[in-house]
């Protein structure tokens, strides 16, 4: 039969950051190839990564169609050299992925501090809004566009001369904080979705940016 000596995929795993979404699986193929199908709960399966020898498949284009839907992918195993028109009616071995809801499960990418500006004893810190591959009306949406007020940023800031950290939070991409006049401060931000109750509710911290370097601007008033 057309599927003898093929091994079903296993360890199907979703890897997703800011909606860029890859399905990975095992094993590395020996004399077999894979085709991936993905579907929402409608059961209308769409094939991707046809007869690939890779053990990953980029499914971003499918999941960004509706990031609030729940998706399932399945990986079919075929003998190497398989041609679809061979006429075998036997269903090849396949394995299902875990269910995946992008809006709830995509990891938050490491944010970046775009700029900071000091005016007297106030500093305005701006977080760069990351672009995603999610579209609306043929326009790519930013992370803020997609998550709206579900997404907050936490700012950690401290005097360059000490280690005691303070925090501030915003549900926009800007912070306005009070600082001591004449002191240099360092900043790091973290993206957070407070409504999530899982390990992926927070991003990693941004790179640290400190006053007195080119990213910021200081105006004493």
């Amino acid at each position: 039969s057309g599927t003898t000596n093929t091994v079903a995929a296993y360890n199907l795993t979703w890897k997703s950051t800011n909606f860029k979404t890859i399905l990975e699986w095992e094993p590395k193929p020996i004399n077999q190839v894979y085709t991936v199908q993905i579907s929402t709960k409608s059961g209308d399966w769409k094939s991707k990564c046809f007869y690939t020898a890779d053990t990953e498949c980029d499914l971003t284009d499918e999941i960004v169609k509706d990031v609030k839907q729940t998706y399932l992918a399945r990986v079919f195993s075929y003998p190497a050299g398989h041609v679809e028109s061979t006429g075998s009616t036997e269903e090849p071995p396949y394995e299902n992925s875990p269910e995946f809801t992008p809006y709830l499960e995509t990891n938050l990418g490491q944010p970046t501090i775009q700029s900071f500006e000091q005016v007297g004893t106030k500093v305005n810190v701006t977080v760069q809004d990351e672009w995603t591959l999610v579209r609306r009306n043929d326009t790519f949406l930013s992370l803020r566009d997609v998550f709206g007020k579900d997404l907050i940023y936490t700012l950690y800031y401290w005097k360059s001369s000490s280690s005691g950290k303070k925090t501030a939070k915003t549900n926009t991409n800007e912070f306005l904080i009070d600082v001591d006049k004449g002191e240099n401060y360092c900043f790091s931000v973290q993206a957070v979705i407070p409504s999530r109750r899982t390990a992926n509710r927070k991003s990693t911290d941004s790179p640290v940016e400190c006053m007195g370097h080119e990213k910021g601007e200081s105006r004493e008033i």
Partner: antibody
């Protein structure tokens, strides 16, 4: 709240036809595969047929292939089962169920009784 | 076709006791593809467990599913009066088939 309401059951003679309907509400109908499951009096559950959200993919248990046709009208939020060439062994309560991916059955109607007898 | 065999056919227990229901498949079923249902007389079935171990929405945590390959188990940690019913397993790895059911009755 998800609600599924079957109708169209009744008494029919062997060889006859019947069309079951299932009116769905409380969810986006086209986003889900749907299924029919039956239960003969005093017996266990038997899957009959499933259909994808678009209606493009249909599946049947061997015993009803060629006799039963599953379909859906997403504009009316309604699932159908056209049953032809009915046999005595088709006598059962027929349940409509919401069926994510066509795999498991997460919401059920209360069922409609089909009796095939002369 | 994968055949599912449930045992025991009938389980006689008292409220507060632990119930262990077995479902055995004629060939290996990926654990992603097994579900459990509860059915009371005159009512439609209700989904309890899918994916062998994931509880459906609104199902109390006294219900748990486990197993892989050909052997699966539904456990009710402490039977409540409303838990006395018939329980069915169902696989969806190859077509859809149900087990014959286990009746949990009051002792």
């Amino acid at each position: 709240e998800v609600q599924l309401l079957e109708s169209g059951g009744g008494l029919v003679q062997p060889g006859g036809s019947l069309r079951l309907s299932c009116a769905a509400s409380g969810f986006t109908f086209s986003n889900y595969a749907m299924s029919w499951v039956r239960q003969a009096p005093g017996k266990g559950l038997e899957w009959v047929s499933s259909i994808s959200g678009s209606g493009d993919y249909t599946y049947y248990t061997d015993s009803v292939k060629g006799r039963f046709t599953i379909s859906r009208d997403n504009s009316k939020n309604t699932l159908y089962l056209q049953m032809n060439s009915l046999r005595a062994e088709d006598t059962a309560v027929y349940y409509c169920a919401r069926s994510p991916w066509g795999y498991y059955l997460d919401s059920w109607g209360q069922g409609t009784l089909v009796t095939v007898s002369s | 076709e994968i055949v599912l065999t449930q045992s025991p056919g009938t389980l006689s227990l008292s409220p507060g006791e632990r119930a262990t229901l077995s479902c055995r498949a004629s060939q290996s079923v990926s654990s992603s593809y097994l579900a459990w249902y509860q059915q009371k007389p005159g009512q439609a079935p209700r989904l309890l467990i899918y994916g062998a171990s994931s509880r459906a929405t609104g199902i109390p945590d006294r219900f748990s599913g486990s197993g892989s390959g050909t052997d699966f188990t539904l456990t009710i940690s402490r039977l409540e009066p409303e838990d006395f019913a018939v329980y069915y397993c169902q696989q969806y790895g190859s077509s859809l088939t149900f087990g014959g059911g286990t009746k949990v009755e009051i002792k």
